[in-house]
């Protein structure tokens, strides 16, 4: 379970891929679409509100609650809308929702090299937000091989 209902901290940051493509959000037909694209130099990057939460890590061997914690984030590009994992469709979608947020809106934060991060689905361990065909998608990662895969690495810049 997530510790408390209030986030530890929040930060506003733009999200880009390992290859410096921007993650952008556009309102189309009363719903938001998520794009992965090269931004023109003069275009401002979209910002995302990251809210950080602390939770117990379920695979803790000790089981005493002392060992085994993880950081989770929710990502909100605009008021009342949050990124959510759709595990059935292997997609990442923006949904309007009220608090308390559903588990699909929580992602375990992983720090990688070069200050890149990865987002692992709370609801589906081993599945990460990734880039596929210029869209965000859910990508199953083989821990022994692809944890450093560029398509699940993102840069946060404030």
């Amino acid at each position: 379970s997530i510790t408390g209902i209030s986030p530890i901290t929040e930060s506003l940051a733009s999200l880009s891929t390992y290859n410096d493509q921007s993650i952008t959000f556009a309102l189309e037909d009363e719903s938001y679409e998520i794009y992965v694209e090269d931004l023109k130099k003069d275009k401002k990057k979209d910002k995302v509100l990251l809210s950080y939460y602390e939770s117990q890590h379920p695979s803790s061997e000790s089981g005493d609650g002392v060992d085994g914690k993880m950081l989770m984030v929710t990502l909100s590009p605009t008021k009342d809308f949050w990124l959510q994992a759709n595990n059935k469709e292997h997609s990442v979608e923006l949904h309007k929702c009220e608090k308390p947020l559903p588990d699909q809106a929580f992602f375990v934060l992983h720090n990688r090299s070069f200050n890149c991060v990865s987002f692992e689905c709370k609801t589906d361990p081993g599945v990460f937000i990734g880039v596929k065909d210029n869209h965000l998608a859910l990508i199953k990662v083989d821990y022994s091989e692809n944890l450093g895969s560029e398509n699940i690495l993102f840069k946060l810049s404030e």
Epitope: S11, E54, S59, S60, E61, D67, L71, N111, S144
Partner: antibody
Framework: QVQLQQSGNDLVKPGASVKLSCKAS????????INWIKQRPGQGLEWIGR????????SYNELFKDKATLTVDTSSSTAYIQLGSLSSEDSAVYFC???????????????WGQGTLVTVSA | DIQMNQSPSSLSASLGDTITITCHAS??????LSWYQQKPGNIPKLLIY???TLHTGVPSRFNGSGSGTGFTLTISSLQPEDIATYYC?????????FGAGTKLEVK
Amino acid sequence: QVQLQQSGNDLVKPGASVKLSCKASGYTFTSYWINWIKQRPGQGLEWIGRIAPGSGFISYNELFKDKATLTVDTSSSTAYIQLGSLSSEDSAVYFCAREFYYGSFYGGFAYWGQGTLVTVSA
Amino acid sequence: DIQMNQSPSSLSASLGDTITITCHASQNIHVWLSWYQQKPGNIPKLLIYKASTLHTGVPSRFNGSGSGTGFTLTISSLQPEDIATYYCQQGQSSPLTFGAGTKLEVK
């Protein structure tokens, strides 16, 4: 309980290399990154790098990229650091440390090995 | 790289005193700051993470505060076992960096 047991102190000659070990117990070894930290006598702490035991994925401090090589053996829950082309500047205590958070370095280092003193001397 | 400027480098205080150590980050690190205590010949011990959260088993006389770029470690009612060197460390971005340390001595 979580424990990190490091190999014994080492006296090595300039120009040689040395491999230090850090055996983990009391938790799921593949779930948490292992970090290596250097402390020269009477000095502060320097972060060398970190390795994800589950994947072997590594992140180095650029200052140590040509000096240190990090590896793991998941079958024995052991992390290793190899230090090459040793000089007197490398004489220090080397600590392994497990991160507080699963997957993330934001929370610092909750558990530390006892340290291995490496002395470089002719 | 984020620089961590810790002060003072040394501090002399009497038992029972309240002491304050500060740490300044060269850029915003939100709450991703940890404090460690290291006694001579011993390993560093995590005292505080997330700027203000006490690690398990750490006495409540230790208090961490701050966010952004300015952080403080306060030890109230100084005890003999608190004599040590204290380090701050930022966890916001790689490479992870430490303050130079504050050596706490008894008057």
